[in-house]
């Protein structure tokens, strides 16, 4: 083995050593036909044209032409790993979900960490929320807890999601990231203040994936065996300790090792340093929800821990790297609507929107039978239903079982014990404007009570360092919002912007000219 190389760097060497006793496999086409020559195409004479009959070439080329699948529209860049969830505390009084059945119970899990806005080749060390999605393979089917590393989000109404993501991605003409788009949207939607403040704090750039917390973020509903329900939030706190990257280190790493997060996770697991997270819930009764000072289903708000303490449930442990990235990480599909009995959705509008959006995007990206892909398959449950056929149907298509319901032939029967919790709703049906549902109280508490003086200083510097590149009228809107949170918050950012704006040449076209370049003096003068 090469000296002092890490397991990720030595992956191929390790693969070879594992197979040392084996003879190399026979090279085949996709159909399994042995290949005699994989280095030369069939031609008429040494300089002649190709023959269509060269199926070794066409088989290879046609497959290569179709290798790429659409990247995820958000969370395109990610790392994955596998492990287990172990119950350490009894919460059966809240939930009948089999995953929580008894202390000591272990459930296999798959986890994917990701950034949000960047493409699949983008750097791991950018300032961006991180996805932290967990798939629990339970006996009652898969439970997908599609979380982030922040307990809140930028918006509370899902109709804004496409516009929000468009504002974070590339300008439709220039194809450049555009600070005007980013800050115009944020400044016009002050419900984003909470998440923006978290994002531009030290927590905005985690040191890899192992040193950050995870949150289900949404409010969910837990239902016990007696049909009694409570609202809940899920938290998973890193046992490795929170570590973040400085702006300088993050920038350096984005150049030197843009896959820093993937590498760090792979190497930790490969060397037996299995990362773990302690899993907690917060619980709110329906009565408490009625008197909660905010909408308890608002994704831009937190539930104060002082009022709704963290209740420990178990441990998430990651102890296996993917065997193949494409098969197990690129193709994994997390879907918040995958909830086994005992875990249900709350009226959280953003969660409700995701219940549709996630399986919809998977059907586009992976095909309508994406749940047949091994990593997505609920392999610890027996899938039996009336869904048939479709592209890439990979199992036995449920054989000769009836494909209609009801039927008289003993095909799968509904399970009354799996009925959803019933709840009474009444109210006006219309589009409710939530734009001004108290966008500042919790942000003020975060700024004043949670951050110390140094952290507040860095927060303002980080915001100003990004906001400076937006137009002045957008800067003013943003500063007005920060000032409403706290006068100091706005004034510190404004002071930094004033400094930047005084230094900034207006409408400059920045052109890099090599010293001693061959450009004529006249051309240089025109730059």
């Amino acid at each position: 083995m090469a000296d002092s190389r890490d397991p990720a760097s030595d992956q191929m060497q390790h693969w070879k050593e594992q197979r040392a006793a084996q003879k190399a496999d026979v090279l085949t086409t996709g159909a399994g036909n042995p290949v005699g020559d994989k280095l030369n195409v069939i031609t008429v004479g040494p300089r002649g044209p190709l023959l269509v009959q060269d199926v070794v070439f066409t088989d290879e080329m046609a497959h290569f032409d179709r290798e790429r699948i659409p990247e995820r529209v958000v969370h395109a860049k990610g790392a994955g790993a596998f492990g287990y969830f172990e119950v350490t505390h009894d919460i059966t009084k809240y939930s009948k979900a089999k995953v929580f059945e008894h202390i000591g119970k272990k459930t296999p899990i798959a986890v994917r960490f990701s950034t949000v806005a960047g493409e699949s080749g983008s750097a791991d060390t950018v300032r961006d929320p991180r996805g932290f999605a967990v798939k629990f393979y339970t006996e009652d089917g898969n439970w997908d807890l599609v979380g982030n590393n922040t307990p809140i989000f930028f918006i509370r109404d899902p109709i804004l999601f496409p516009s929000f993501i468009h504002s974070q991605k590339r300008n439709p003409q220039t194809h450049l990231k555009d600070p005007d788009m980013v800050w115009d949207f944020w400044s016009l939607r002050p419900e984003s203040l909470h998440q923006v403040s978290f994002l531009f704090s030290d927590r905005g750039i985690p040191d890899g994936h192992r040193h950050m917390n995870g949150y289900g973020s949404h409010t969910f509903k837990l239902v016990n065996a007696n049909g009694e329900a409570v609202y809940c939030k899920f938290h998973y706190k890193t046992d490795q300790g929170i570590k973040n990257l400085s702006v300088e280190d993050a920038a350096r790493l984005s150049q030197e090792d843009p896959d820093y997060g993937i590498r760090d996770l792979f190497n930790a697991i490969a060397t037996g340093k299995y990362p773990s997270w302690t899993f907690y819930i917060q619980v709110m009764t329906f009565n408490q929800a009625e008197t909660f000072p905010f909408n308890p289903f608002d994704l831009t708000k937190v539930w104060p821990h002082k009022d709704y303490p963290l209740i420990p449930v178990g441990k998430l442990v990651l102890n296996r790297n993917p065997v193949n990235y494409f098969a197990e990480v690129e193709q994994i599909a997390f879907d918040p609507s995958n909830m086994p009995p005992g875990i249900e959705a709350s009226p959280d509008k953003m969660l409700q929107g995701r219940l549709f959006a996630y399986p919809d995007t998977h059907r586009h990206r992976l095909g309508p039978n994406y749940l047949h892909i091994p990593v997505n398959c609920p392999y610890r449950a027996r899938v039996a239903n009336y869904q048939r056929d479709g592209p890439m149907c990979m199992q036995d298509n449920q054989g000769g079982a009836p494909n209609y319901y009801p039927n008289s032939f003993g095909a799968p029967e509904q399970q009354p014990s799996a009925l959803e919790h019933s709840i009474q709703y009444s109210g006006e049906v219309r589009r409710f404007n939530t734009a001004n549902d108290d966008n500042v109280t919790q942000v003020r508490a975060f700024y004043v009570n949670v951050l110390n003086e140094e952290q507040r200083k860095r927060l303002c510097e980080n915001i100003a360092g990004h906001l400076k590149d937006a137009q002045i009228f957008i800067q003013k809107k943003a500063v007005k919002n920060f000032t409403e949170v706290h006068p100091d918050y706005g004034s510190h950012i404004q002071a930094l912007l004033d400094k930047y704006n005084a230094e900034k040449p207006k409408n400059a076209i920045h052109t890099f000219v090599q010293s001693g370049s061959h450009l004529a003096a006249r051309e240089k003068a025109n730059l």
Epitope: P151, F198, R203, K237, V302, W303, P304, D307, N449, V450
Partner: nanobody, 117 residues
Framework: QVQLVESGGGLVQAGGSLRLSCAAS????????MGWFRQAPGKEREFVAT????????YYADSVKGRFTISRDNAKNTMYLQMNSLKPEDTAVYYC??????????WGQGTQVTVSS
């Protein structure tokens, strides 16, 4: 910064009682979630109990349920852990914890509880 100061630990015989206290600043006490954890020699730190600001909601580890009682006095910015019917397996360093909605966790220096048989 958040400062937590535990007291009340000591040596006690099996079946005996102790009352631990955790003092914090008013800002900490009114901002953070509060709870008790413990760490026995050679073991991981484990949850003991947690309490809401109003005292309405309390949660306990199964191993201490019915024997330990968590409480708080918001006027004194102090949280307590009344430990009755102590057992040798309760021997550990007991830590006060404050945690925020944003993942911050703060710990006191710990107070040693030793239960002899």
């Amino acid at each position: 910064q958040v400062q937590l100061v535990e007291s009340g630990g000591g040596l006690v015989q099996a079946g005996g009682s102790l009352r631990l206290s955790c003092a914090a600043s008013e800002r900490t006490f009114n901002t953070y979630g509060m709870g008790w954890f413990r760490q026995a020699p050679g073991k991981e730190r484990e949850f003991v109990a947690t309490i809401s600001w109003s005292g309405d909601s309390t949660y306990y580890a199964d191993s201490v349920k019915g024997r330990f009682t968590i409480s708080r006095d918001n006027a004194k910015n102090t949280m307590y852990l009344q430990m009755n019917s102590l057992k040798p397996e309760d021997t550990a360093v007991y830590y006060c914890n404050a945690n925020s909605e944003y993942g911050d966790s703060y710990w006191g220096q710990g107070t040693q509880v030793t239960v002899s048989s």
